[in-house]
């Protein structure tokens, strides 16, 4: 087919000899046509078009990909000649970075509809070469990581010696999506979640007298784990006191937040301290009410049967412990005013006799 | 790119303490695990333990008595010794970056970083 | 420990081969295996980690599948600098345990 009409762009990928890095290219067709064909896709006027024409509508076509031979050949197909790079959508991939990528890249619709169609292509001239080793010691590297829950940044390769002010306007891609949000060399990330892995690219503008080229690097993010270096946190019981009826039965949880260790071995107990006694009260199994990638919350009750005079005067403790340290919670039960009658009280009474009887000759206490 | 370099004797007598350091350069030891991981000649990998940056260990049930690894964040190295050692213990000894990678709502561990290893015959 | 073994312990293949190395684990490990390669003299470099997920910069002819206790490392077309020994390594539970490796040689 005749290229003469495809609209060009000029790129320039300066790898780094010390690094394994990736190259993108976006079929990113002319403007004029996409009304026409290469975007008639299902988007509300009140939605914006994405970057790339082809990726979110099933019934659009993909791309056919070429290369054109410097010697003035026929143009070959990417898939055939190159195993190198790869055709994914409506980008090609080269995996491997190297002078002998130079040369015109051409893509356009595998389908082709109407005559206006032929001339829906882009002829992208992609220059390679080597970095110079000098040019900055601290560059950014091709391979970012984020930690899971924590502030962070990617940084434009490219770009990443230059400060802030210095730095030309940039364009962000995350897969293939345009990232409307920044137009600085880095991208802040407030709170890391996985959401923020991806392929990132990041293209600015470099003009010379003769011609203007996008500069282009691409960046791939991975979301990581790390050990908290918190101890846990309780979130219930967050009062100290906690008002309660004579001879009726209680329950008291106590969930806290475990942050993220690799090896979990999360400790959750109540112990009961009573004067100068203190013993562990066998209760119900902790359990997990949620678990994210960052924490997880546990949950464990105690369970009174029937409260009696004697428990209030004892405080009830939540212990939590992981490997970074321990945290405790004490719980002081109040009687509630006005609430029950004499029987409740003789009741309880009886039931504080009993209990005294099986606590001394059940528990083991120790100091 | 970040880089590692294993350091230490290449020869230790029967029954002394093997001692290596791990240098990291070209990045930081913040928010990682490092690995200590060792090959006899020409046999397979075995993995003696790791240390988060923070300082939490884990250490191969099979080696824990003679092991302890440590991490010194300000020299960007941390370190292995392994006490009371024997002949079996003559092997290739690498350092690694073994990272938790958050993707598919789990985790996957992986070594993804390692030096080039360091020969240690144990030999009177 | 959980023990992983793979199958063949050597292979021998031409360039252009598909080849298959096995890896079966003594009990279940969900995905929790990576795959490495290792050259003579050289440290081993990371191919896939979750048992599936290519690290970036790995050929796309490198591919591995399975879950559980059965897991698979395809190469799909041979390449010379493919020639290497291959180790799978389980991070389910704690020791972290490799593979006896699979010896990959040029037929």
């Known amino acids: 087919f005749n290229i003469s009409g495809c609209s060009t762009k000029k790129l320039l990928w300066a790898y780094s000899t010390r690094s394994e890095e990736e190259f993108i290219l976006f079929c990113d067709l002319p403007e004029p046509q996409k009304s026409h064909f290469c975007h008639r896709s299902q988007l509300s006027p009140t939605q914006v078009p994405d970057h790339l024409p082809f990726t979110d509508s099933k019934d659009l076509p993909d791309v056919q990909w070429y290369r054109q031979p410097s010697n003035g050949d026929p143009l070959e197909d990417i898939r055939k000649s190159y195993p190198h790079i790869i055709q994914d959508k409506c980008t090609l991939r080269f995996l491997t970075p190297g002078v002998n990528n130079t040369g015109s890249y051409i893509c356009r619709p595998k389908m082709i509809k109407s005559p206006y169609d032929v001339a829906c292509c882009v002829k992208m001239i992609l220059e390679v070469k080597p970095q110079s080793n000098a040019s900055c010691e601290n560059s950014a590297s091709h391979k970012q990581d984020l930690l899971l829950g924590s502030t962070g940044s990617i940084s434009c390769p490219s770009l990443s010696c230059q400060s802030d002010a210095q730095s030309p306007e940039v364009t962000w891609y995350k897969n293939g999506k345009l990232l409307s949000m920044t137009r600085s060399n880095r991208i802040v990330v407030d709170e890391v979640y996985i959401y923020h892995q991806g392929t990132y690219v990041c293209d600015y503008t470099q003009s010379d007298t003769a011609s203007s080229w996008t500069v282009r690097a691409v960046v791939q993010v991975r979301t990581i784990v790390g050990d908290t270096k918190l101890k846990p946190d309780i979130l219930d019981p967050v009062e100290s006191t906690l008002e309660v009826e004579l001879g009726k039965p209680l329950t008291i949880s106590c969930k806290a937040r475990f942050g993220f260790e690799r090896v979990f071995n999360p400790v959750m107990k109540w112990y009961i301290k009573d004067a100068d006694l203190e013993w562990e009260v066998s209760v119900p199994e902790a359990k997990s009410i949620k678990s994210t990638l960052k924490d997880e919350i546990i949950e464990r009750n105690i369970i009174l049967e029937k409260v009696t005079q004697r428990d209030l005067r004892r405080t009830f403790v939540c212990f939590v412990q992981n490997s970074i340290g321990n945290t405790t919670q004490s719980v002081q039960l109040k009687e509630k005013r006005g609430s029950g009658g004499l029987n409740d009280i003789f009741e309880a009474q009886k039931i504080e006799w009993h209990e005294t009887v099986r606590f001394q000759s059940h528990h083991h206490h120790h100091h | 790119q970040v880089q590692l370099q294993e350091s230490g004797p290449g020869l230790v007598k029967p029954s002394e303490t093997l001692s290596l350091t791990c240098t990291v350069s070209?990045?930081?030891?913040?928010?990682?695990?490092w690995s200590w991981i060792r090959q006899p000649p020409g046999k397979g990998l075995e993995w003696i333990g790791y240390?988060?940056?923070?300082?939490?260990?884990n250490y191969n049930p099979s080696l824990k008595s003679r092991v302890t690894i440590s991490v010194d964040t300000s020299k960007n190295q941390f370190s292995l010794k392994l006490s009371s050692v024997t002949a079996a213990d003559t092997a290739v000894y690498y350092c690694?970056?073994?990272?938790?990678?958050?993707?598919?709502?789990?985790?996957?561990?992986?070594?993804?970083?390692w030096g080039q290893g360091t020969t240690v015959t144990v030999s009177s | 420990a959980i023990q992983l073994t793979q199958s063949p312990s050597s292979l021998s293949a031409s360039v252009g081969d598909r080849v298959t190395i096995t890896c079966r684990a003594s009990?279940?490990?969900?995905?929790?295996l990576a795959w490495y390669q290792q050259k003579p003299g050289k440290a081993p470099k990371f191919l896939i980690y979750?048992?599936?997920s290519l690290e970036s910069g790995v050929p796309s002819r490198f591919s591995g599948s399975g879950s559980g206790t059965d897991f698979t490392l395809t190469i799909s077309s041979l390449q010379p600098e493919d020639f290497a020994t291959y180790y799978c390594?389980?991070?389910?539970?704690?020791?972290?345990?490799f593979g006896q490796g699979t010896r990959l040689e040029i037929k």
């Open positions: 390594q389980q991070f389910n539970s704690y020791p972290i345990t």
């Open positions: 240390i988060f940056y923070s300082g939490t260990t």
């Open positions: 979750g048992a599936s």
């Open positions: 009990q279940g490990i969900s995905s929790a």
């Open positions: 690694a970056r073994d990272v938790g990678i958050a993707a598919r709502n789990s985790y996957y561990y992986v070594m993804d970083v």
């Open positions: 070209g990045g930081s030891i913040n928010n990682y695990y």
